[in-house]
């Protein structure tokens, strides 16, 4: 999906209002310096591409993020503020349902969510205003 035509300010507002708090809850008890951030993004569409990938694509050692509250709210925000996003996610949703039934917080998941926090921070405040 090409995130170029999303309403970035509305997504930012959704993040600051709710998603950020859910990420903090997920990370509670984890030190901010515990993980090295290896994923970065260069502009807002790229940030959303990386956020979507880390949030919804199962990875080795962390298959369960898509069922977390922050993930569901992220999905809702993208569906509302990115034209045509919902349609592209139908197949992905089917696969996600098959992928995992239970929620397990592993160290790998905590590391992934730490990466997500950095990506969201970057998305919210790109130094050069990308439209």
């Amino acid at each position: 999906y090409d995130f170029t035509n999303c309403d970035f300010e509305k997504i930012k507002a959704a993040y600051l209002s709710t998603i950020s708090k859910d990420l903090i809850t997920y990370m509670s008890g984890t030190k901010s310096t515990e993980f090295n951030n290896t994923v970065s993004c260069s502009n807002r569409p790229h940030c959303l591409t990386e956020i979507q990938s880390l949030t919804f694509n199962p990875t080795a050692g962390c298959a369960s993020l898509a069922k977390e509250m922050f993930a569901m709210k992220t999905k809702a925000a993208l569906a509302i503020w990115c034209p045509g996003y919902s349609e592209t996610q139908i197949n992905a949703t089917q696969a996600m349902k098959k992928a995992r039934k239970s929620k397990v917080t592993t160290n790998k998941c905590l590391e992934q969510v730490s990466q997500l926090q950095g990506l969201w921070r970057r998305f919210n405040r790109p130094l050069l205003k990308q439209q």
Epitope: A13, W120, R122, N124
Partner: antibody, heavy 120, light 111 residues
């Protein structure tokens, strides 16, 4: 605990340059915008610019665009601000500051400040 | 650039009194229903300290006697009952539009 420690006071001649350092600890340096703000004696706060350590991208106040250079060394978790062609009006306390956790655009961690005096 | 005008320049009050500081922006600092205006306190020889973010949210460790309100172009910082340690200079700052700008400051002094 997130902390920023700046280099010591500097006395410079007009026309010369100064490079102030800001060493970060207690947070993932590469993912936070780092800003520089100055304050002339008895005056208010003036934004110089910012840098994103992740890729070195910068944003400057137009007033300083030609004279200020912001850089980072990720290996030592240090941000630098170099100001060239110094004049007496550049006499000020220079602060580095970290932008907040969420990208709201406020500064939640500040360095202690570096006094730069420009005098002939 | 967005110009932030703070008033009054100096406010003389006594401990226990209520302080009301104003910050007016030359254009709106709102975006998608959020107001990107922040407030700082600065004491002599110290860096500024965050008081309030996004107009009305208390910074970490800030006492509840501090509160903020406003949206668009008009914002207010209120200190309900002044403590001796509250006498300082207060700055507003906007981030909605580059470049980031600060107000010129309001000095709160003991009467």
């Amino acid at each position: 605990e997130a902390q920023l420690v700046q280099s010591g006071a500097e006395v410079k001649k007009p026309g010369s340059s100064v490079k102030v350092s800001c060493k970060a600890s207690g947070f993932t340096f590469s993912t936070y915008n780092m800003h520089w703000v100055r304050q002339a004696p008895g005056q208010g706060l003036e934004w110089i610019g910012a840098i994103y350590p992740g890729n070195g991208e910068t944003s400057y106040n137009q007033k300083f665009k030609d004279r200020a250079t912001l850089t980072v060394d990720k290996s030592t978790r240090t941000a630098y601000m170099e100001l060239s062609s110094l004049r007496s009006e550049d006499t000020a306390v220079y602060y580095c500051a970290r932008e907040d956790d969420y990208g709201e655009g406020y500064f939640d961690v500040w360095g202690q400040g570096t006094t730069v005096t420009v005098s002939s | 650039d967005i110009v932030l005008t703070q008033s009054p320049a100096t406010l003389s009050l006594s401990p226990g009194e209520r302080a009301t500081l104003s910050c007016r922006a030359s254009e709106s600092v709102d975006s998608s229903g959020l107001s990107f205006m922040h407030w700082y306190q600065q004491k002599p020889g110290q860096p500024p300290r965050l008081l309030l973010y996004r107009a009305s949210n208390l910074g970490s460790g800030i006492p509840a006697r501090f509160s903020g309100s406003g949206s668009g172009t008009d914002f207010t910082l209120t200190i309900s009952s002044l403590e001796p340690e509250d006498f300082a200079v207060y700055y507003c700052q906007q981030i909605n539009t580059d470049p980031l700008t600060f107000g010129q400051g309001t000095k709160l002094e003991i009467k």
